[in-house]
Interface confidence: low
């Protein structure tokens, strides 16, 4: 982009500030909150998106309290620490010096502790199960049509390679999308399943992160697929470490 061009925007992330101040006058976009340069040719990391979301003026936010994730993400929204590549830092702390360890999608995987808490590595979430309940329809969706449409959505809208969509299960009215991506499978340039799941989650809530694109209009053979509840389960490569007290 040159300075004269007025379409300097980030198509994959509207929570950015863009200006033509990159090399050769090219458009460069920085995430709100962190000020980090983002690659607008692909999805922005969930960590930078959460940070941007928390930095937005309170009255400008249209937040849905994430009660529907209570089973899996009890802590909900927080202002995360991101590393220079935009990934979650393994240890997260709040302003009162309470700390905890998170996985690669930013979900707490240990009990909360103090500043002495050690989180040796960022543990990868390699399996995500997205559990959807759709609104009643005249009849059940055809499973293979639903499967094809959801795979197309993840490939075309979120640019997630189809090999990472492990399965689509359907028992009316419940749809389950399984995303799997081991560390060894993820090549340079591949979209992370955690980021794709987060964009999908925001789309489903009507809070699209894409710049200027219409909201998600999901149809199966022309029939609208309207989701009324979403649950997302995260499985890590190393099991989480919670005390027995929390498990009872």
């Amino acid at each position: 982009h040159t300075a004269a061009q007025d379409n300097c925007t980030c198509p994959t992330n509207k929570m950015t500030v863009c200006s033509p101040d990159g090399p050769g006058g090219r458009c460069q976009c920085r995430a709100l909150g962190s000020g980090m340069a983002v690659d607008c040719s692909t999805l922005t990391s969930k960590c930078l998106l959460l940070k941007a979301r928390m930095s937005a003026p309170k009255n400008a936010r249209t937040l849905v309290r994430p009660s529907e994730h209570a089973l899996v993400d009890n802590d909900g929204l927080y202002d995360p620490d991101c590393d220079p590549e935009g990934r979650f830092k393994a240890r997260q702390c709040n302003q009162t010096s309470v700390c905890w360890c998170v996985n690669s999608v930013g979900v707490r995987r240990t009990d909360k502790g103090d500043l002495s808490l050690r989180c040796d590595e960022l543990v990868r979430t390699h399996h995500i199960l997205i559990d959807l309940r759709h609104r009643p329809t005249a009849g059940a969706f055809n499973h293979s049509d639903l499967d094809a449409e959801l795979r197309r959505l993840f490939r075309e809208r979120y640019r997630l390679h189809p090999k990472f969509v492990a399965a689509v299960h359907y028992e009316q009215p419940t749809i389950q999308i399984e995303l799997r991506q081991n560390t060894s499978q993820k090549a340079a340039g591949d979209v992370d399943i955690g980021d794709a799941a987060y964009y999908f989650e925001r789309d489903i809530k009507g809070e699209s992160l894409f710049q200027g694109r219409g909201g998600l209009d999901l149809r199966v053979r022309g029939e609208p697929l309207q989701v009324e509840r979403t649950l997302i389960y995260y499985l890590d490569e190393i099991p989480p470490k919670f005390s027995m007290k929390r498990l009872t």
């Epitope: 990159g22 690659d39 607008c40 692909t42 640019r159 090999k163 340039g189």
Partner: antibody
């Protein structure tokens, strides 16, 4: 509907310069890479290189470094291939094609119709 | 550079036949292989990517398989409109490279 519309056929003399355009529509231009491919008469397809439409960074195959140059006019959703100091052996058809950005996505899902370039004195 | 070798330049077939085209990579390309169909005077058309994934709108008679260095493209029941040149391409690493093409023609 996603499409790539290429400029028309070109007749040039050796030593001249040609610029081929490829106008994208139906998708956000900066969310896909633009690849360029050469199709020699009676021969197969040969990759010239690609340009990252968001960063503007080009990458060329070894055989095409020097005289071949990619550029963008993002506001017009258009990519360009310029060939300078034309030689007779540059006579062929040139295709633009859309791709993703990472190696898992370097397949070409949408192609332009091709631009025939003829170099003759 | 990775060389993609399509062993048959021409393959003769009849309508209704099952036909398989092979492609061999000079080094391991995992499953990063695409297959294209090109008809005279037209641009190539993507059929298969990542070895076995059928592109949107491609009929299910077209399938792909393989990994590492050996790949196969199959048409389960050839239709008259399938007569064309088929190219394999590795999308594993740059420079991206194509096979020389296999022309499918009627017996």
């Amino acid at each position: 509907q996603i499409q790539l519309v290429q400029s028309g056929p070109e007749l040039k003399k050796p030593g001249e310069t040609v610029r081929i355009s490829c106008k994208a529509s139906g998708y956000t231009f900066t969310t896909a890479g633009m690849q360029w491919v050469q199709k020699m008469p009676g021969k197969g397809l040969k990759w010239i290189g690609w340009i990252n439409t968001h960063s503007g960074v080009p990458k060329y195959a070894e055989d095409f470094k020097g005289r071949f140059a990619f550029s963008l006019e993002t506001s017009a959703s258009t990519a360009y291939l310029q060939i300078s100091n034309l030689k007779n052996e540059d006579t062929t058809t040139y295709f633009c094609a859309r791709s993703g950005f990472g190696s898992s996505y370097w397949y070409f899902d949408v192609w332009g119709a091709g631009t025939a370039v003829t170099v003759s004195s | 550079d990775i060389v993609m070798t399509q062993s048959h330049k021409f393959m003769s077939t009849s309508v209704g036949d099952r036909v398989s085209i092979t492609c061999k990579a000079s080094q391991d390309v995992s499953t990063a292989v695409a297959w294209y169909q090109q008809k005279p005077g037209q641009s190539p058309k993507l059929l298969i990517y990542s070895a076995s994934y059928r592109y949107t709108g491609v009929p299910d008679r077209f399938t792909g398989s393989g990994s590492g260095t050996a790949f196969t493209f199959t048409i389960s029941s050839v239709q008259a409109e399938d007569l064309a040149v088929y190219y394999c391409q590795q999308h594993y690493i740059t420079p991206l490279t194509f096979g020389a093409g296999t022309k499918l023609e009627l017996k």
